[in-house]
């Protein structure tokens, strides 16, 4: 227990102390007091450095004194022979004697008392940063005006934290600037700007004077800037050592000013402002930026436009431009959007043609359409080559985005007709010689295919049956063979408006305008046994001259049979109309004079008994095209005749080309257009 005073006597005092003794006393007075130890009697064997016998006074690890020998007071008014004053509240006294004493020594008598210490003056280290106040048993620290005592109750500092700056521009300085800043302080300032603005700090070198760094380069007083996970500083010294313009890239900045106990410097002053957050000028491939600027900042909006042939795609739709905003985080909105090559997609297929699978369908790629040769050709030109254009369409230099149209090649038989074996009035033929030949089964007649949807025939063939059944592609018209050939279904029959309809057709003597068109429900697929015949051109080249040869074909009456089962054909010359008029009508149904002959009729035949006959009606009189010897055109249609095996009359197709074209045009589907 600490005591305020006490007495310490050597063993056996005042008798002689024994040999070989070691005894210690621990003195403790209350906290806040020092110890005054004084000896009133001292009689201990003397030796050099008190090596034999001694009384030792120890404070902590320090020996305050070591006594031996005899002492007497110098002051007649005081009994004290030796005294010690320590500013600590603990002291140890140790007495030692060796194995022999040459004389009789009586030892010592000592007393201790607790004494007040002045903590403010008695120590090398001053306990208070500013004002120290001593009292009995202790002290307290106090501070000058505008300072406050820290929690350690020793250090004073200034209250310079807690300020939050939100204005877009401002000035901040150390406390008392330009007078010396307070020591032993930590000042924290916060700048908090609207998102999208970065704090920019500007200082002048001369506005900065902070206690310099120590020999190791550590700042004793320091100014530090903290922006998110970035730190600028610590800074100290005379004149600002850092960059005079600090772009923090953040809308929040903490400024921390830390000072120690010493120093008399003026401190610092800075300005700050909010700069709109910059966004990087990004290199976006295949696009242009508008407006183009050297620097983009928060809230700037740019229109990014893809170069021709590039687009931004989302799902199945695309756009050629978009907007991007410089955002509060310094990044562009819509940065995911990239201009990529336009994809024209898999090219559309075309009827009767094909397109090779493209290696690529992206902008700039090239594809080629071809028609199914030799039966189809590209009607609308352009060569069939298309490139993927910037608008996402496959484009041809001539046709633009319009697709090529593969239309049947007309008038070219796969095998030319040769009169092989001479039979009466004609030869056997193969359908490949006359692929345009159409067979009508009721009435038994013929027709000529002129394109995918239309059959040309004589009006008298269809006047009694507006829904004829027709076949193509077969040489034989035996029922078993017809079952395997292509049957054509009519959609509508168009009889020439100049054809006079009679109540008793058998008595007809006027075959003027004996022409009709049959519109088919479905298109005909062309091939070696099915392909159309050409129509005559409108130029004078297509005016027939006497002696011009033409081919007729059909399954009509022959010398031997009323109907042929296999296709027959003959080559006939064109004859003057009078030759037909001169032939006596076989089994006339009226006076010979009643039969009408018009310029709409062609007379042909008269050679070797070759002629068309009943059952051949509507078939083509095919003449070689004067402008393209590889092709045949339908110069005439088998119409009527005075007598089989002589001369026959054929509808002059050239006179009806306008009507044919108009009728087909007015009754076509959009697909055909």
């Amino acid at each position: 227990e600490p005591t305020m005073y006490g007495e310490i006597l050597s063993p056996n005092y005042p008798q002689a102390y024994p040999s070989e003794v070691e005894k210690s006393w621990d003195i403790e007075v209350p906290e806040g007091y020092g110890i005054h130890l004084y000896f009133t009697h001292l009689d201990i064997e003397l030796s050099e450095n008190c090596a034999y016998d001694s009384v030792q006074i120890i404070s902590g690890d320090t020996e305050e004194g070591r006594l031996c020998g005899q002492r007497s007071s110098n002051n007649p008014h005081s009994p004290i022979v030796e005294e010690f004053q320590v500013p600590y509240n603990k002291l140890q006294v140790i007495f030692k004697s060796d194995f022999s004493n040459e004389e009789r020594f009586t030892g010592f008598a000592a007393y201790y008392v607790a004494t007040d210490i002045n903590e403010c003056t008695d120590f090398v280290d001053v306990p208070c940063s500013h004002f120290c106040n001593n009292f009995i048993g202790g002290y307290f620290c106090s501070c000058p005006p505008e300072y406050f005592l820290h929690d350690d109750m020793k250090n004073c500092g200034v209250n310079c934290s807690g300020d939050v700056f939100t204005a877009l521009i401002g000035e901040i300085a150390s406390p008392n600037y330009p007078k010396p800043y307070p020591e032993n302080s930590r000042c924290e300032y916060q700048i908090r700007l609207e998102k999208g603005f970065q704090v920019v700090v500007t200082l002048r070198r001369e506005d900065f004077d902070v206690e310099a760094a120590d020999s190791a380069g550590n700042c004793l007083d320091s100014l530090v800037f903290v922006a998110g996970d970035r730190q600028f500083g610590p800074y100290c010294g005379h004149g600002f050592p850092g960059p005079l313009n600090i772009e923090t890239k953040s809308n929040a900045l903490d400024i921390i000013f830390q000072t120690d106990l010493t120093g008399q410097k003026k401190g610092w002053k800075l300005r700050y402002h909010g700069d709109p957050m910059p966004c990087p000028k990004e290199d976006t491939p295949n696009s242009t930026w508008e407006p183009a600027k050297a620097k983009y900042v928060f809230r700037d909006v740019v229109q990014i436009t893809c170069l021709d042939g590039f687009e931004v795609v989302e799902g199945r739709v695309g756009a050629t431009s978009f907007y991007s905003t410089c955002q509060s985080n310094g990044k562009w909105s819509n940065s995911k959007l990239k201009c990529q090559p336009v994809d024209c997609g898999i090219p559309e297929s075309i009827e009767n043609g094909k397109v090779e699978d493209p290696e690529s369908t992206l902008f700039g790629s090239v594809i080629r359409y071809t028609c199914e040769e030799p039966y189809y050709y590209m009607e609308n030109g352009g060569g069939g080559e298309y490139h993927c254009a910037g608008n996402g369409s496959w484009v041809n230099e001539v046709l633009g985005p319009e697709l090529p149209k593969c239309v049947p090649v007309c008038g070219v038989p796969r095998e030319p007709f040769e009169e092989k074996q001479r039979i009466i009035g004609g030869s056997d033929a193969d359908i490949k010689n006359f692929p345009w030949q159409v067979f009508f089964d009721n009435p038994w007649a013929g027709g000529a295919l002129i394109n995918e949807y239309w059959v040309l025939t004589a009006a008298h063939v269809v006047e009694g049956n507006r829904e004829p059944t027709m076949y193509v592609g077969s040489t034989s018209v035996q029922t078993s063979r017809l079952a395997k050939s292509k049957m054509l279904t009519p959609e509508h029959v168009f009889i020439h408006p100049g054809w006079k309809l009679l109540e008793v057709p058998e008595g007809r003597t006027n075959f003027d305008n004996d022409i009709a068109l049959v519109r088919l429900k479905d298109p005909v697929k062309m091939g070696p046994t099915v392909s159309p015949i050409c129509l005559p051109g409108t130029s004078s080249d297509y005016n027939l001259m006497d002696g011009d040869l033409g081919l007729i074909s059909g399954w009509g009456r022959t010398e031997k049979r009323d109907r042929a089962v296999r296709l027959k054909a003959a080559r006939l010359p064109v004859a003057p109309l009078r030759k037909c008029k001169e032939v006596k009508v076989e089994k006339p149904t009226a006076d010979a004079e009643a039969y009408v002959f018009t310029p709409n009729m062609i007379c042909a035949g008269g050679e070797k008994g070759m002629d068309s006959c009943k059952g051949d009606s509507g078939g083509a009189f095919a003449v070689q095209d004067p402008n393209d010897k590889t092709k045949f055109y339908a110069a005439g249609l088998v119409s009527w005749g005075p007598q089989c095996g002589t001369y026959g009359l054929y509808t002059r197709v050239k006179n009806y080309v306008d009507w044919i074209m108009k009728t087909m045009q007015e009754n076509s589907t959009p697909r055909e257009d």
Epitope: R299, V301, V312, G315, F322, Y323, S333, N334, K336
Partner: antibody, heavy 116, light 107 residues
């Protein structure tokens, strides 16, 4: 096909927080922005913010700043929206939506009711 | 923030009618404007993007026009399934803002 499936309805007390999930299928969320839009009863649509799941960048409408947190878990292809300090006026249907050029696909919506 | 104002707030029309809804932006949004349709209890559906482009699968009776601050959504011939609420939205700059909506009701 593209689908956004949101978590079920929630009832919360004022002051609490709510976290709504939006599970995407048929596409990778890293290739798109994921937005959150809310609609109070009988009211219009209100954009709250978006996330770029590729780098976790977010932008929030000023009105919700500090209260809303949008996150994304690319491993599960899911976006989340957490709204804290709920008040009664936060009662609404919350939608997630996917965009690049526009909000082409939307979740079915999650009704959050805030009531004491 | 950019404010979007739609007019009218609501309108009644009959099947077959031609209907026009307008949307005005408080500042220039160029062509960064989309239109959405929302039916009760359903999520919004995109109709028109970039002011005038019809989204895939949207009937041709819906069309959009305008640029800058004034935009129009037109339904050329109303069908029974078109009765809904229509919203415009600017995507020119964040925050992306919606109009307050136009409720199209059957007369």
């Amino acid at each position: 096909q593209v689908q956004l499936v949101q978590s079920g309805a929630e009832v919360k007390k004022p002051g609490a927080s709510v976290k709504v999930s939006c599970k995407a299928s048929g596409f990778n969320i890293k290739e798109y922005y994921m937005h959150w839009v809310r609609q109070a009863p009988e009211q219009g649509l209100e954009w709250m913010g978006w996330i770029d799941p590729e780098n976790a960048d977010t932008i929030y409408a000023q009105k919700f700043q500090g209260r809303v947190t949008i996150t994304a878990d690319t491993s599960t292809n899911t976006a989340y929206m957490e709204l804290s300090s709920l008040r009664s006026e936060d009662t609404a249907v919350y939608y997630c939506a996917r965009s690049r050029l526009f909000f082409a696909y939307w979740g079915q919506g999650t009704l959050v009711t805030v009531s004491s | 923030d950019i404010q979007m104002t739609q007019s009218p707030k609501s309108l009644s029309a009959s099947v077959g009618d031609r209907v026009t809804i307008t949307c005005r932006a408080s500042q220039d949004v160029r062509t960064a404007l989309d239109w959405y349709q929302q039916k009760p209890g359903q999520s919004p559906k995109l109709l028109i993007y970039s002011a005038s482009y019809r989204y895939s699968g949207v009937p041709s009776r819906f069309s959009g026009s305008g640029s800058g601050t004034d935009f129009t959504l037109t339904i050329s011939s109303l069908q029974p399934e078109d009765f809904a609420t229509y919203y415009c939205q600017q995507q020119y700059t964040t925050p992306y803002t919606f109009g307050q909506g136009t409720k199209l009701e059957i007369k």
